[in-house]
C-alpha cells in the first residue's frame, strides 16, 4: 500500500441510461439482442485539484481510475464492488499529503464492445460526463450527489477519511498509540496524545510520581514511586537525613544536626542541662551545669565524692593519740581519752616527768603548759618511746636482697650478681675479661655472654669452629679438615673447590683415567 495520510473514497451507486444511447445520440453497437441498443458501461474517474472551471483533460493530479464493465445501460452497484474482483466500491484515492479541503471530480461513463477493451481516448465511446468541484471536510459521513443530463443519471457519494494513526482537518497529524520507553499514550479525536494513567509530559514519557512526592528531593522511574535523592528520606522524600550519630538534633537540610533545647555538641549528645535532667548530686549537694554535658556538685559538710555520695569519716585515719577512741560526727569528730590523757586529740598527759613515763631510755622534759615530752633514743618512737622502729619495714633492699634489722640500723644481704648498700648495683661480670680470642663481652645479672669472632664458638669463644660443620662440599663429596682449612674429596665425575662442577664425560675405552681432583677449598 502506498504510504498516505488519508483516502478520498468515491462510491458509484446507480447509473441510468434510459434509451441506451451514446452521448452523440448513436446507438450502442454490440448489443446481444433486444433492445437493439445496449451500452456495456464502464467508468473513467479523474480526481484533481480544485478548478473554478473544471477541465476534463489530464493531469488527474489527485489520481485516476478506470473500472471494468459494471453493467448494461441502467444498473445499481452494491458496496464492495459485487462479482468482479477487479473492482472495489468505493474507489480509493490515497493521499500522501495534507488534504486541502477542495477537489475537482470528472466521471465519464463509457461504452465498450469488448470487456477487454477499456480504452478511454475515443470520444465516440462517451455516454455521459460529469465534471464538478466541491469543498469537503474530513469525516466518516458520505456526501451524496446525483448528476442528471437529460438521457442519463449518475448517483454517487464521496468522502475523505484519514488513514489509521492520522488525524486532524487535513489528516496531517500523526499519532500511533504506544506503551513503551518512547511513550505511554493513546490518541484523542484530533490526534493529540492522551497519556495513559500514571504518565505525563509532551510524549507521555514522564512518570507521575506518588502524589505528594517532593518535587525537589524525590523522583520516580515508574508511576506511583517516590525515590529519594541523596540526603532525603521518608515516603514523600521531604525529610532530611541528619548528620550520622546526631542524637538530640534535627535538620532543615541534609547532614545537619541542629540541637534541641538543652543539648549541645557536634552530635547534640552533650546535656547542657544535666543537673535538671539527671539530678546527679546526692545528699543535698548543689549542682552546677558546666556545659558539654558535664556538671559539678558542691557537697554539704560531711560529704565527698563526684556526686557527694560518700559520707566523710573524720575518724579515718584516727586522729586520737595515746589510745583515745574516735567518734565520727557530721563534718567533725570527738576523741574519748584513756585515763591520764586529755586534749582535743588526747595529746596532753596528766603525768609529769616525776612519774617516769618515758620508756626505752627516752629522756623526759616537763612542758610549761602541763604534761611532758619524751626524746627517744635511736631505734624507738612514740609519745612515750614505746614503739621500737623496724628499719626493715620500708623494704629498703632491692633485687631480692634480705633485710637484717640491726636495732639502730639495717643491713642488706645481696643476691649473687648485686652489690651496694641497697643491693641496687649490678656486679660487672665482664670485669675479668672472660671472652677469649677477641670475643665481645656483654654483662648480665650474675652472668655474661660472649659474641665470638669468625672461627670461634662456645661460651667463652675458646672453641675453634669446625670447617666442615656446614657441609661446604657438594654432590656427595667427602670433607676433610686441614688446620684452619677444609679439603673436598669429590665423587667420580665432579670437580671444583667444592665439587660443584660436573666434569665432561670421557668416551668409552678400556682404561679410564680417574681425573677426579683433590682440590683444596678456602675455609
Amino acid at each position: 500500500q502506498v504510504w498516505s495520510s488519508g483516502v478520498f473514497e468515491l462510491k458509484l451507486q446507480e447509473f441510468v441510461n434510459k434509451k441506451g444511447l451514446l452521448g452523440n445520440r448513436n446507438c450502442c453497437r454490440g448489443g446481444a439482442g433486444p433492445p437493439p441498443c445496449a451500452c456495456r458501461t464502464f467508468f473513467r474517474v479523474c480526481l484533481k485539484h480544485y478548478q473554478a472551471s473544471v477541465s476534463p483533460e489530464p493531469p488527474c493530479t489527485y489520481g485516476s481510475a478506470v473500472t471494468p464493465v459494471l453493467g448494461v445501460d441502467s444498473f445499481s452497484l452494491p458496496d464492495g464492488g459485487g462479482a468482479d474482483s477487479a473492482f472495489s466500491n468505493p474507489i480509493r484515492f490515497p493521499f500522501g499529503f495534507t488534504w486541502p479541503g477542495t477537489f475537482s471530480l470528472i466521471i465519464e461513463a463509457l461504452h465498450t464492445d469488448s470487456p477487454d477493451d477499456l480504452a478511454t481516448e475515443n470520444p465516440e465511446r462517451l455516454i455521459s460526463r460529469l465534471a464538478t468541484q466541491r469543498h469537503l471536510t474530513v469525516g466518516e459521513e458520505w456526501s451524496q450527489d446525483l448528476h442528471s443530463s437529460g438521457r442519463t443519471d449518475l448517483k454517487y457519494s464521496y468522502r475523505f477519511v484519514c488513514d489509521e494513526h492520522y488525524y486532524g482537518e487535513g489528516c496531517s497529524v500523526f499519532c500511533r498509540p504506544r506503551d513503551d520507553a518512547f511513550g505511554h499514550f493513546t490518541c484523542g479525536e484530533r490526534g493529540e496524545k492522551v497519556c495513559n494513567p500514571g504518565w505525563k509530559g509532551p510524549y507521555c514519557t514522564e512518570p507521575i510520581c506518588l502524589p505528594g512526592c517532593d518535587e525537589q528531593h524525590g523522583f520516580c522511574d515508574k508511576p506511583g514511586e517516590c525515590k529519594c535523592r541523596v540526603g532525603w528520606q521518608g515516603r514523600y522524600c521531604d525529610e532530611c537525613i541528619r548528620y550520622p550519630g546526631c542524637l538530640h538534633g534535627t535538620c532543615q537540610q541534609p547532614w545537619q544536626c541542629n540541637c534541641q533545647e538543652g543539648w549541645g555538641g557536634l552530635f547534640c549528645n552533650q546535656d547542657l542541662n544535666y543537673c535538671t535532667h539527671h539530678k546527679p548530686c546526692k545528699n543535698g549537694a548543689t549542682c552546677t551545669n558546666t556545659g558539654q554535658g558535664s556538671y559539678t556538685c558542691s557537697c554539704r559538710p560531711g560529704y565527698t565524692g563526684a556526686t557527694c555520695e560518700l559520707g566523710i569519716d573524720e575518724c579515718d585515719p584516727s586522729p586520737c593519740k595515746n589510745g583515745g577512741s574516735c567518734t565520727d560526727l557530721e563534718n567533725s569528730y570527738s576523741c574519748t581519752c584513756p585515763p591520764g590523757f586529755y586534749g582535743k586529740i588526747c595529746e596532753l598527759s596528766a603525768m609529769t616527768c616525776a612519774d617516769g613515763p618515758c620508756f626505752n631510755g627516752g629522756r623526759c622534759s616537763d612542758s610549761p603548759d602541763g604534761g611532758y615530752s619524751c626524746r627517744c633514743p635511736v631505734g624507738y618512737s612514740g609519745f612515750n618511746c614505746e614503739k621500737k622502729i623496724d628499719y626493715c619495714s620500708s623494704s629498703p633492699c632491692s633485687n631480692g636482697a634480705k633485710c637484717v634489722d640491726l636495732g639502730d640500723a639495717y643491713l642488706c644481704r645481696c643476691q649473687a650478681g648485686f652489690s651496694g648498700r641497697h643491693c641496687d648495683d649490678n656486679v660487672d661480670d665482664c670485669a675479668s675479661s672472660p671472652c677469649a680470642n677477641g670475643g665481645t663481652c656483654r654483662d648480665g645479672v650474675n652472668d655474661f655472654s660472649c659474641t665470638c669472632p669468625p672461627g670461634y664458638t662456645g661460651r667463652n669463644c675458646s672453641a675453634p669452629v669446625s670447617r666442615c660443620e656446614h657441609a661446604p662440599c657438594h654432590n656427595g663429596a667427602t670433607c676433610h679438615e686441614r688446620g684452619h682449612r677444609y679439603v673436598c674429596e669429590c665423587a667420580r665425575g665432579y670437580g671444583g673447590p667444592n665439587c660443584q662442577f660436573l666434569l665432561p664425560e670421557l668416551p668409552p675405552g678400556p682404561a679410564v683415567v680417574d681425573l677426579t681432583e683433590k682440590l683444596e677449598g678456602q675455609g
Epitope: I208, P211, D214, Q233, G234, Y236, D238, E239
Partner: antibody
Framework: EVQLLESGGGLVQPGGSLRLSCAAS????????MHWVRQAPGKGLEWVSF????????YYADSVKGRFTISRDNSKNTLYLQMNSLRAEDTAVYYC??????????WGQGTLVTVSS | DIVMTQSPLSLPVTPGEPASISCRSS???????????LNWYLQKPGQSPQLLIY???NRDSGVPDRFSGSGSGTDFTLKISRVEAEDVGVYYC??????????FGQGTKVEIK
C-alpha cells in the same frame, strides 16, 4: 514564626465564584507543598486540594474537581483557591495548611465561605 | 480511598484521669521504611486544628508529654496520661499514607464530665 493567614471568604450565591488567598510567612514558602482543607459547620475535616512546592502538580477531592483551581505565587509567598460554580454544600471554613511528610504541621486560622441565595 | 474510623465519637473525662481514643484505617499505613503514616490533631473550641502526633508516635514540638501515640498497621491509639481542662476539644486522626484524598476520622469530642 510560621504563620498562615487566609482571606477572601464571604457570602456568595449558588453558581457564583470566590477566590481565597493564604499569605505565608516565617518559612521558605517555595520549599513546601500546600493544601486546602475545609470544615462544614458542625462537621469534621475534609481535604480539598494539594499543590506541589513548585506548582507543577495539583490534586483535588472528587467533590470539587473541575470547579476549584489551586495555584500559588512563590514570589509573593501566597497560595490561592479559585472556586467556581459554588454550591450550598461548599459552605465551610477553609483552612490552608503546610504539608510535611504526610501531615499538616501548620494551619491558618481559616476563612468562612457561605454559599446561599 | 482509605477510610478512617474513630471510636468513641464522644468521650467524657475526669481531670487527672487517663483517656484513650482509637483510630482504625481500612488499609495498612506502614511504609517500607517502617514508619506509620498516621497523625493526630486537636481542634480546641473556636480554633484551627493543631498537630499533636505525627507518624504514629512522634510528639510535635511544644506538645505536652502526657500525650502519646501508639499502634501500627491499621490500629492506632492516642493516650492522654492525665487529662487537664485545657485538653477538651475534638481529636482527629488522619492518614498521610495515600492521596488523593487525604482522609480524616470523624472526630472524637472530649469534654469534662
Amino acid at each position: 514564626e510560621v504563620q498562615l493567614l487566609e482571606s477572601g471568604g464571604g457570602l456568595v450565591q449558588p453558581g457564583g465564584s470566590l477566590r481565597l488567598s493564604c499569605a505565608a510567612s516565617g518559612f521558605t514558602f517555595s520549599s513546601y507543598a500546600m493544601h486546602w482543607v475545609r470544615q462544614a459547620p458542625g462537621k469534621g475535616l475534609e481535604w480539598v486540594s494539594f499543590i506541589s512546592s513548585g506548582g507543577s502538580t495539583t490534586y483535588y477531592a472528587d467533590s470539587v474537581k473541575g470547579r476549584f483551581t489551586i495555584s500559588r505565587d512563590n514570589s509573593k509567598n501566597t497560595l490561592y483557591l479559585q472556586m467556581n460554580s459554588l454550591r450550598a454544600e461548599d459552605t465551610a471554613v477553609y483552612y490552608c495548611a503546610r504539608f510535611r511528610s504526610g501531615y499538616f504541621d501548620y494551619w491558618g486560622q481559616g476563612t468562612l465561605v457561605t454559599v446561599s441565595s | 480511598d482509605i477510610v478512617m474510623t474513630q471510636s468513641p465519637l464522644s468521650l467524657p473525662v475526669t481531670p487527672g484521669e487517663p483517656a484513650s481514643i482509637s483510630c482504625r484505617s481500612s488499609q495498612s499505613l506502614v511504609h517500607s521504611n517502617g514508619a506509620d503514616y498516621l497523625n493526630w490533631y486537636l481542634q480546641k473550641p473556636g480554633q484551627s486544628p493543631q498537630l499533636l502526633i505525627y507518624k504514629g508516635s512522634n510528639r510535635d514540638s511544644g506538645v505536652p508529654d502526657r500525650f502519646s501515640g501508639s499502634g501500627s498497621g491499621t490500629d492506632f491509639t492516642l493516650k492522654i496520661s492525665r487529662v487537664e481542662a485545657e485538653d477538651v476539644g475534638v481529636y482527629y486522626c488522619q492518614q498521610g499514607y495515600d492521596f488523593p484524598p487525604f482522609t480524616f476520622g470523624q472526630g472524637t469530642k472530649v469534654e469534662i464530665k
